[in-house]
């Protein structure tokens, strides 16, 4: 699992009277915030499912993993995590589900070893370019993030404020080249109904990159050439017809790559030569024997790996003189 | 600027429960928090609720934990405040308010309706 886990066998849950904790002073080593579990032994807090309506200002020094899940956050501020002393320990911060819908310029600055970050389903309508990158120099300083998991990030249709949402996820991603270091990048269930042309190139450290169940129809103009560190790269359940020879040609020249591809509504006709001539020699994607036509209807649920030319052929397009009404 | 137009309050006894209904002008996109907050005879403006416009997260005030649920309507433009377990020390003017931060202040809302009455006695 790409979520912060912890083997904390042993919490101390706080008292409700310290709710009220001033926020000013240093933490005590063994406190714990209103509403959280923690445990020291696994460097671990928990604030799960609890209602919170803002980060708890008195998190001990010592935590590793936080646990923000299923609260109700709403807004991510400059600093949220900044902390007196810092929080130099935190590596794995879980924010999924906790109805975010902003998050601002620098919300995980002074956090220097964070590695892991999720706010997956959460509807951000609102993420600054400079949410990862914390400044909006042209360049940054490095990100320590390793790993951020975005899946079902997208609001819903009607709260999307008349952007693309693709591009505001982009901009985040690539601000002051801070997440060069990035190896893992989740972007499941977000609508993508493309990927813009630079975003892969610049994340050059990338090791697995999940994009399932989106709507993407075509790779023609994504480059996974620079990629050379690429392992995994999902693609299920998008809105693909075909991989033409460009991007073929780039997914076997990655070296240790494994293509995951099922559920997509391919389109077996004479453009599908290429690919199924690919997919029979190549061995990177994963169960491609379960690879099926969508379309045109005479081919629906034929197995990919057993077509041959003959059958892939395009219907003739008649000139306009020979269309009957 | 966005007008803002509460309707719902009325007399009712104690333990009984009331609807308020905040009918705004337009959809509110500058404003992304809605709010409620109450002004009793005598006292200063009191923050009720809140909910955000896009995902909806919810706060209350620690008096009305549990009695009080506040929601919106994105189609309709229209915020709402269930109240049940009613008691005499919720008698005051309600107010509907739109801001942009997710705060409890006053000072964090900007535009504001006339407000509605609600009584409770027996």
């Known amino acids: 699992s790409s979520s912060p886990t912890s083997s904390a066998s042993s919490f101390s849950s706080s008292a409700p009277f310290l709710a009220s904790a001033v926020s000013a002073q240093p933490p005590l080593p063994d406190q714990c915030p209103a509403l959280c579990e923690c445990s020291e032994a696994a460097r671990t807090v928990k604030c799960v499912n609890r209602n919170l309506t803002e980060v708890p200002t008195d998190l001990p020094a010592y935590v590793r993993n936080l646990f923000l899940t299923g609260n109700q956050l709403a807004v991510l501020p400059a600093g949220a995590f900044a902390r007196r002393p810092p929080l130099a320990e935190l590596a794995a911060l879980n924010l999924s589900g906790s109805r975010l819908d902003e998050v601002r310029a620098g919300a995980f600055e002074h956090l220097p070893s964070l590695r892991q970050l999720d706010l997956s389903h959460n509807p951000l309508a609102d993420l600054s370019p400079f949410a990862f990158s914390g400044s909006n120099a042209s360049v940054s300083a490095p990100s320590p993030l390793v790993e951020l998991i975005l899946n079902h990030i997208v609001p819903p249709e009607d709260e999307r404020q008349n952007r693309s949402f693709e591009g505001m996820v982009v901009a985040a991603l690539l601000a002051g080249r801070a997440l060069q270091g990035l190896r893992r990048l989740e972007l499941a269930s977000n609508h993508f109904l493309y990927l813009p042309r630079d975003v892969l190139a610049q994340l050059p450290s990338l090791r697995h990159l999940d994009l399932s169940n989106n709507s993407l129809v075509s790779l023609t103009y994504v480059s996974f050439r620079n990629l050379t560190h690429l392992e995994s790269l999902h693609l299920e359940d998008n809105a693909l017809k075909v991989l033409h020879n460009g991007t073929l040609a780039e997914l076997q020249g990655l070296p240790h790559i494994r293509v995951f591809l099922d559920n997509n509504p391919w389109v077996c006709d004479c453009h599908m030569a290429d690919m199924v001539t690919w997919l029979k020699e190549t061995e990177v994607v994963q169960g491609k024997d379960r690879l099926t036509c969508a379309y045109p209807e005479k081919m629906r649920n034929r197995v990919l790996l057993e077509l041959n030319s003959a059958d892939l052929d395009c219907d003739p397009i008649l000139p306009p003189s020979l269309q009957t009404s | 600027e966005v007008q803002l137009v509460e309707s719902g309050g009325g007399e009712v006894q104690p333990g009984g429960s009331l609807r308020l209904s905040c009918a705004a002008s337009?959809?509110?996109?500058?404003?992304?928090?809605m709010a409620w907050f109450r002004q009793a005879p005598g006292k200063g403006r009191e923050f009720v609720a809140a909910?955000?416009?896009?995902?909806?997260?919810?706060r209350y005030a620690e008096s009305v934990k549990g009695r009080f649920t506040i929601s919106r309507d994105n189609a309709k433009n229209t915020l709402y405040l269930q109240m049940s377990s009613l008691r005499a020390e919720d008698t005051a003017v309600y107010y509907c308010?739109?801001?942009?931060?997710?705060?409890?202040?006053?000072?964090?809302?900007?535009?504001w309706g006339q407000g509605t009455l609600v009584t409770v006695k027996p």
């Open positions: 909910v955000r416009w896009i995902g909806g997260a919810t």
């Open positions: 337009r959809r509110p996109f500058s404003s992304k928090t």
């Open positions: 308010a739109a801001g942009q931060a997710w705060g409890t202040k006053f000072t964090d809302y900007s535009d």
